[in-house]
Amino acid sequence: QGGAAEGVQIQIIYFNLETVQVTWNASKYSRTNLTFHYRFNGDEAYDQCTNYLLQEGHTSGCLLDAEQRDDILYFSIRNGTHPVFTASRWMVYYLKPSSPKHVRFSWHQDAVTVTCSDLSYGDLLYEVQYRSPFDTEWQSKQENTCNVTIEGLDAEKCYSFWVRVKAMEDVYGPDTYPSDWSEVTCWQRGEIRDACAETPTPPKPKLSK
């Protein structure tokens, strides 16, 4: 998605099928207020962005309200009247689901069921990662709904859990972004803990491809 025209790099993120963020990096125009023009239908006239992102006082992106739209975004980044980058993209290819909310844990001896509020749209994977201080890496389990049961846990160990949402690649394509991780929650013997001793900080998910 970062194809260059006149040295312009762009990034598109469609946040939770609600807001599209298009950002640009154009070293040639670093001190210029480039303008962003867009339309959701190839036949319409272009609208100009009304909600710019600024970096060091100059335009660097645009935020567009685009709730639940399965549309092509046609856009043009301009220096005055001169287009420096023009493209069209399916917005859903750049979906980033929102971070899981209302994460809940129900324990049954050596198993835990992790639930959270399902997002309002489908074709998603809800991934739970977990580990104890004795594990060298994170274990992972994912389901199509936010109802993931993990079995075979050691009741005496403290486990850290977190959850994220991913768009299914066979539906949305390879260029989507996983959600941010939920807060880390620690559990031992079915009881919530403030922390698990000696648990390293989990790696942050990569935003850009």
Epitope: S98, H102, R104, S182, E183, T185
Partner: antibody
């Protein structure tokens, strides 16, 4: 310290739209995990959760009132808003805003509350 | 929706008493139970979260217990300043719901 304060019109007529503002300080809705909710209490009755907005603009509503409710925020001004359309006398209540506690991750409770603002709906 | 029931709507006790207020959920809420205190002037404070965890600044005279569907709040050595209405709230499933409240009075 954390403080929240609600403001509203005080009196409305049936079918009008209620607009409430929660102004807060001592925390930021830019912080991951943070949220603010609205709860109401008719005089002499129990508490009813209405809506909740999260740091990333996710919104949750009580399904029994969802068609009437809109929650929004202005992060830069430390404010959260609630609109209730087409109010009726049954909407007469004290309306509270409250912060989602962040002391333990994924345990949702409201750790700080405003003092409440009273609404009377009367023709 | 999960119904939260506080069967005792008002409770009368003497200063110095130990008082227990109960709350029942219509289904298992896996310990996601919070307790709030509402003073006569309307001020609301969180006392206990996740069944038994004391919110910061809350005196240790307040304690919570329970599991599954049955939960309780205990206040030891009752004082005048404890006169209030106490509400339970489940945070397990949306919509979050509250009990009807138990009003605590002095004999």
């Amino acid at each position: 310290q954390v403080t929240l304060k609600e403001s509203g019109p005080g009196i409305l007529k049936p079918s009008q739209t209620l607009s409430l503002t929660c102004s807060f300080s001592g925390f930021s809705l830019n912080t991951s995990g943070m949220g603010v909710g609205w709860i109401r209490q008719p005089s002499g009755k129990g508490l009813e959760w209405l809506a909740h907005i999260w740091w990333d603009d996710d919104k949750y509503y009580n399904p029994s009132l969802k068609s009437q409710l809109t929650i929004s925020k202005d992060t830069s001004r430390n404010q959260v808003f609630l609109k209730i359309t087409s109010v009726d006398t049954a909407d007469s209540a004290t309306y509270y805003c409250a912060r989602r506690a962040s002391h333990v991750s994924t345990v949702d409770s409201f750790d700080f509350w405003g003092q409440g603002t009273t609404l009377t709906v009367s023709s | 929706d999960i119904q939260m029931t506080q069967t005792t709507s008002s409770l009368s006790a003497s200063l110095g008493d130990r008082v227990t207020i109960s709350c029942r959920a219509s289904q298992d809420i896996s310990n996601y139970l919070n307790w709030f205190q509402q003073k006569p002037d309307g001020t609301v404070k969180l006392l206990i979260y996740y069944t038994s965890r004391l919110h910061s600044g809350v005196p240790s005279k307040f304690s919570g217990s329970g599991s599954g569907t049955d939960y309780s709040l205990t206040i030891s050595n009752l004082e005048q300043e404890d006169i209030a209405t106490y509400f339970c709230q489940q945070g397990y499933t949306l919509p979050w719901t509250f009990g009807g409240g138990t009003k605590l009075e002095i004999k």
